[in-house]
């Protein structure tokens, strides 16, 4: 099972983190990244089964993102369009994870260097006016078998963990205080 955030094992890339990727960039409405059954990728205002993701380090600082419900990997075309694929293509579906000082993360295609951001509202497939990288807040996700506890209205605390926080973070990125030794 995915391990708790407090575990020192998260200092290594071997573990799967179950997360919702939440973005609240000013240019678009607040949303959780969703990988849908038909392979489209979009944003949902609320957490949903389609937005529960598994983040796993492939290499130091590089991750793959799997939709738990759909068993589809998050992938990106050379033009920046996002899609969900049952087949993992390392060229299209690997993302460099960069930690920001405020607890948010930025994801870039390892192959193309293109930033990951949700499609704009006009088109479900691609954003015709690419912007800078979107910032995502990884929110903890419960294991699939466990329902969300009822009656909790407060937002979940931010998870500032990285799949590999002790390895490849360059001098320009922040380091999460939760991993300070």
């Amino acid at each position: 099972h995915p391990i708790p955030d407090s575990s020192p094992l998260l200092q290594f890339g071997g573990q799967v983190r179950q997360r919702y990727l939440y973005t609240d960039d000013a240019q678009q409405t607040e949303a959780h990244l969703e990988i849908r059954e038909d392979g489209t990728v979009g944003g949902a205002a609320d957490q949903s089964p389609e937005s529960l993701l598994q983040l796993k380090a492939l290499k130091p600082g590089v991750i793959q993102i799997l939709g738990v419900k759909t068993s589809r990997f998050l992938c990106q075309r050379p033009d920046g369009a996002l899609y969900g694929s049952l087949h993992f293509d390392p060229e299209a579906c690997s993302f460099r994870e960069l930690l920001l000082e405020d607890g948010y993360n930025v994801y870039q295609s390892e192959a193309h260097g293109l930033p990951l951001h949700l499609p704009g509202n006009k088109s479900p497939h691609r954003d015709p006016a690419p912007r800078g990288p979107a910032r995502f807040l990884p929110l903890p996700g419960l294991p699939p078998a466990l329902p969300e506890p009822p009656g909790i209205l407060a937002p979940q605390p931010p998870d500032v963990g990285s799949s590999d926080p002790l390895s490849m973070v360059g001098p320009s990125q922040g380091r999460s205080p939760s991993y300070a030794s």
């Epitope: 099972h1 995915p2 391990i3 094992l9 200092q11 290594f12 890339g13 071997g14 573990q15 799967v16 598994q54 796993k56 380090a57 492939l58 290499k59 130091p60 793959q64 799997l66 738990v68 068993s71 990997f73 049952l86 087949h87 993992f88 699939p144 590999d164 002790l166 390895s167 490849m168």
Partner: antibody, heavy 117, light 107 residues
């Protein structure tokens, strides 16, 4: 071409230690995790542990706690595994591997360790 | 730890036949399953990972499928160089564990 070069066979006495090197070439050493796998004669494979070459952080199979210590030397692109307090059940072939999301995409040729008095 | 159970333990097949090897995980491992081939006296080689992604240089006659806890490796039109042992391995969460292996022999 990616290559993981291991040292030759080792014959060691019970209670002794052995340190097996694995020299990586053909790729950037710090870009991938390095791992180790045990294969006893005629048996399946057992994952021992992985190490992040950037910082030496390791994650180990608890079955090998106190038995195997993983280290790296970035300057020579070499990973090491030290096995201590060797006993007959440690007789096996030990492989170094390159890790990619937990899959092991390249393997060394293996180092045979025989524990015998 | 997650247990991986492979079947059959061994099989005999002729060149040109189709072979299917199965692997069962003791719990859900999602899409994190790999397959390896090992020839006598040699190191294992990665064939497939993430259930169905072929490793570099692996012929397209190999294919992986499955989900959750049940997986299979299919070899279409078995070639002489395909004989050897095959192992499944989960790469969901450490410790990674392997199946007991399937020995594919010439009939």
């Amino acid at each position: 071409e990616v290559q993981l070069q291991q040292s030759g066979p080792e014959l060691v006495k019970p209670g002794a230690s052995v340190k097996i090197p694995c020299k990586a070439s053909g790729y950037t050493f710090t870009d991938y995790y390095m791992g180790w796998v045990k294969q006893s004669h005629g048996k399946s494979l057992e994952w021992i542990g992985d190490i992040n070459p950037n910082n030496g952080v390791t994650i180990n199979n608890q079955n090998f706690k106190g038995k195997a210590t993983l280290t790296v030397d970035k300057s020579s692109s070499t990973a090491y595994m030290e096995l201590r307090s060797l006993a007959s059940e440690d007789t096996a072939v030990y492989y170094c591997t390159r890790g990619y999301g937990g899959a092991l995409d390249y393997w060394g040729q293996g180092t045979s360790v025989t524990v015998s008095s | 730890d997650i247990q991986m159970t492979q079947s059959p333990a061994s099989l005999s097949a002729s060149v040109g036949e189709t072979v299917i090897i199965t692997c069962r995980a003791s719990e859900n491992i999602y899409s994190y399953l790999a397959w390896y081939q090992q020839k006598q006296g040699k190191s294992p080689q990665l064939l497939v990972y993430n259930i169905r992604t072929l490793a570099e240089g692996v012929p397209s006659r190999f294919s992986g499928s499955g989900s959750g806890t049940q997986f299979s490796l299919k070899i279409n039109s078995l070639q002489p160089e395909d004989f050897g042992s095959y192992y499944c391995q989960h790469h969901y969460d450490s410790p990674w564990t392997f199946g007991g292996g399937t020995k594919v022999e010439i009939k």
